[in-house]
């Protein structure tokens, strides 16, 4: 079975800069999985932002602004990475990567 | 409707290069990771190369390592392929296909013939 | 890399009939496994994906089955516009491979 392990427990930002989480995956190839990012602000339903695919397709919530997420994969080391551009009050929240394995 | 365009495809000798491009249309070009497939006369398909939606990570089949290179330029909805130190065995009718999650390669090109010979 | 062989090479069938392709893999490819048909002079067309999802507008007779390492495609009651080649393609890891494909002939 796969296992999903985020290494940053929180990560602090200051206002405009740019906040990078990481995904790393064990247990199951990431090179033919797809990965998802989703968020959770406080006191909201989770929400999915962005996911990418086995060769690099990206599908993301309508509603995101244009240019404000970057989803990366890099199989070599089984990590995907969720890149949030200039961070603002209202990206407060906890960031869940996933995947679906058969 | 999804569209996409090969061109750049001719004759050429061996040892020289070869720009191939791939014009999209009908479809968010910059979301999607895109592929090159080619197929010698009278044979199978042979995937070529692969690049993500925004260029960060590329594959390549072996056969075509470190002489042929995937690029795109999404403000131009256009992928391509430079092809260098061209060899008999590369001549083919190369596709550009569209990827994607489940249901990759669901569009492709009409194809380009490359032919290599002296 | 992963070696995808596909029998028989050649399928000779009458229109009706049903006809069944096997794509055989190295490896297990789970079910990332996709068909394809080719027609002469034409582009490929995706048929199946992930072993047995057929594409959009796809005809019903279309099947696909299998995971691991073993597949089929089953054509239930070929029409005449199916005598094509058909190919498998795994893309469980890089590079991508595609099978040999099986000729798909009018008897």
């Known amino acids: 079975a796969g296992h999903l392990e985020q290494p940053q427990i929180s990560s602090t930002k200051t206002l405009s800069k740019t906040a990078r989480l990481e995904c790393v995956v064990s247990g199951i190839t990431i090179s033919a999985t797809s990965v998802y990012w989703y968020r959770e602000r406080p006191g909201e339903v989770i929400q999915f932002l962005v996911s990418i695919s086995y060769d690099g397709t990206v599908r993301k919530e309508s509603g995101i602004p244009s240019g404000k997420f970057e989803v990366d994969r890099i199989p070599e080391t089984s990590t995907s990475t969720l890149t949030i551009h200039n961070v603002e009050k209202q990206d407060i929240a906890t960031y869940y990567c996933a995947l679906w394995e058969v | 409707e999804v569209q996409l365009v090969e061109s750049g495809g001719g004759v050429v000798q061996p040892g020289k290069s070869l720009r191939l491009s791939c014009t999209a249309s009908g479809f968010t070009f910059g979301t999607y990771g895109m592929h090159w497939v080619r197929q010698a006369p009278g044979k199978g398909l042979d995937w070529v190369a692969v690049?993500?939606?925004?260029?960060?990570?590329?594959y390549y089949a072996d056969s075509v390592k470190g002489r042929f290179t995937i690029s795109r330029d999404n403000s131009k909805n256009t992928l391509y392929l430079q092809m260098n130190s061209l060899r008999t065995e590369d001549t083919a009718v190369y596709y550009c296909?569209?990827?994607?999650?489940?249901?990759?390669?669901?569009?492709w090109g009409q194809g380009t013939l490359v032919t290599v010979s002296s | 890399d992963i070696v995808m062989t596909q029998t028989p090479a050649t399928l000779s069938l009458s229109p009706g009939e049903r006809a069944t392709l096997s794509c055989r893999a190295s490896?297990?490819?789970?079910?990332?496994l996709a068909w394809f048909q080719q027609k002469p002079g034409q582009a490929p067309r995706l048929l199946i994906y992930?072993?047995?999802n057929r594409a959009t507008g796809i005809p019903a007779r279309f099947s696909g089955s299998g995971s691991g390492t073993d597949f089929t495609l089953t054509i239930s009651s070929l029409e005449p516009e199916d005598f094509a080649v058909y190919y498998c393609q795994q893309r469980s890891n890089w590079p991508l491979t595609f099978g040999g494909g099986t000729k798909v002939e009018i008897k």
């Open positions: 992930d072993a047995s």
């Open positions: 690049i993500w939606y925004n260029g960060s990570n590329k």
């Open positions: 490896q297990s490819v789970i079910d990332y």
């Open positions: 296909a569209r990827g994607g999650f489940g249901e990759s390669f669901d569009s």
